[in-house]
């Protein structure tokens, strides 16, 4: 499911709970995606030794995964709500091609990979409703994404495993940085 079912199982259910606010819904959606990533990382780490590999830098050079930097306005110093929100949405849109790449990379967690992808689309919609300056959000070029996907899928097995590991790790970090910033808004 692209949206978490009811309350997080680890959360405390309060009787007659108020409907979730927009911010709470976004927070919960991110936590739901993080759960999915955690499950996917388990399979990746069990299947290969990528999680302990020191050769990450080699593969990382070929990937242009979104990352939070101070200039993006999401850090405490220079925090800027609108700039930060644009960065979060833009980053998530850029991750979509990498999430598409993950779709055929899992055996036992195929549904989980699909859930992460669909939940991210829902999260983007939530955030777009929150953003005032939608014009500042640049959507990735579909042609560029298509050729990137082809290139990633043409890699040898070791590089594909490493790419999967790096995407999951970077996506997790990006979501955590986003979660932290959104809680300030």
């Amino acid at each position: 499911a692209p949206v978490p079912p009811g309350e997080d199982s680890k959360d405390v259910a309060a009787p007659h709970r108020q409907p979730l606010t927009s911010s709470e819904r976004i927070d919960k959606q991110i936590r739901y995606i993080l759960d999915g990533i955690s499950a996917l990382r388990k399979e990746t780490c069990n299947k290969s030794n990528m999680c302990e590999s020191s050769k990450e830098a080699l593969a990382e050079n070929n990937l242009n995964l979104p990352k939070m930097a101070e200039k993006d306005g999401c850090f405490q110093s220079g925090f800027n709500e609108e700039t930060c929100l644009v960065k979060i949405i833009t980053g998530l849109l850029e991750f979509e091609v990498y999430l598409e790449y993950l779709q055929n990379r899992f055996e036992s967690s195929e549904e989980q990979a699909r859930a992460v992808q669909m939940s991210t689309k829902v999260l983007i919609q939530f955030l777009q409703k929150k953003a005032k300056n939608l014009d500042a959000i640049t959507t990735p070029d579909p042609t560029t994404n298509a050729s990137l996907l082809t290139k990633l899928q043409a890699q040898n097995q070791w590089l594909q495993d490493m790419t999967t590991h790096l995407i999951l790790r970077s996506f997790k970090e990006f979501l955590q940085s986003s979660l932290r910033a959104l809680r300030q808004m």
Epitope: K10, D11, V12, E24, R31, L34, S38, M68, F75, Q76, S77, R169, K172, E173, Q176, S177, L179, R180, R183, Q184
Partner: antibody, heavy 119, light 105 residues
Amino acid sequence: QVTLKESGPTLVKPTQTLTLTCIFSGFSFKTSGVSVGWIRQPPGKALEWLALIYWDDDKRYSPSLKNRLTITRDTSKNQVVLTMTNMDPVDTATYYCARSYDDYLYYALDYWGQGTLVT
Amino acid sequence: DVVMTQSPSSVSASVGDRVTITCRASQDIDNFLAWYQQKPGKAPNLLIYKVSSLRSGVPSRFSGSRSGTDFTLTITSLQPEDFATYFCQQTRRFPLTFGPGTKLE
């Protein structure tokens, strides 16, 4: 296993700058979701949160002490440093460093150093 | 800042008793609440995070619950090693703030 240990002067004169170092092992800032914070406790009183530094070098400070505090880290040495300027007798307390590690950033402090008393 | 108030400030109890400590937040903090135990001369020790999640290794006699902005720590059958001071901490908004503590004696 996870350990943290604070070090620094036990005695500081008024107006001086206090520099405290937290050396840790068993985890690193390479893991997203990790943060290390400083908390102090005056003798017989409650805990007061001071500052925190994240895996990606973002920082948070207590607003009431923001102008006096600086938190930094050295990832290669696995240490976090807190400096506090313009010390005053009211700053007498046990200073703790503590770790938080949580995917959802709930900031519960799961491992603490033994604390260092600064007078 | 989110102000955390704790009651009672101290409580006398005997081994085997059920003890309840309450913490109130001055504003909504969702489920961002932790409980710590501290013994004299020692650092605090995390017992419960996210209102009711028991930290690994913490005895099941400790439990946490929430009702709005009121949070409760319950010790069902007090053991000799449970006599200590208990602090709550909100972790929803910066600055992170602690309650004044409840001394269990």
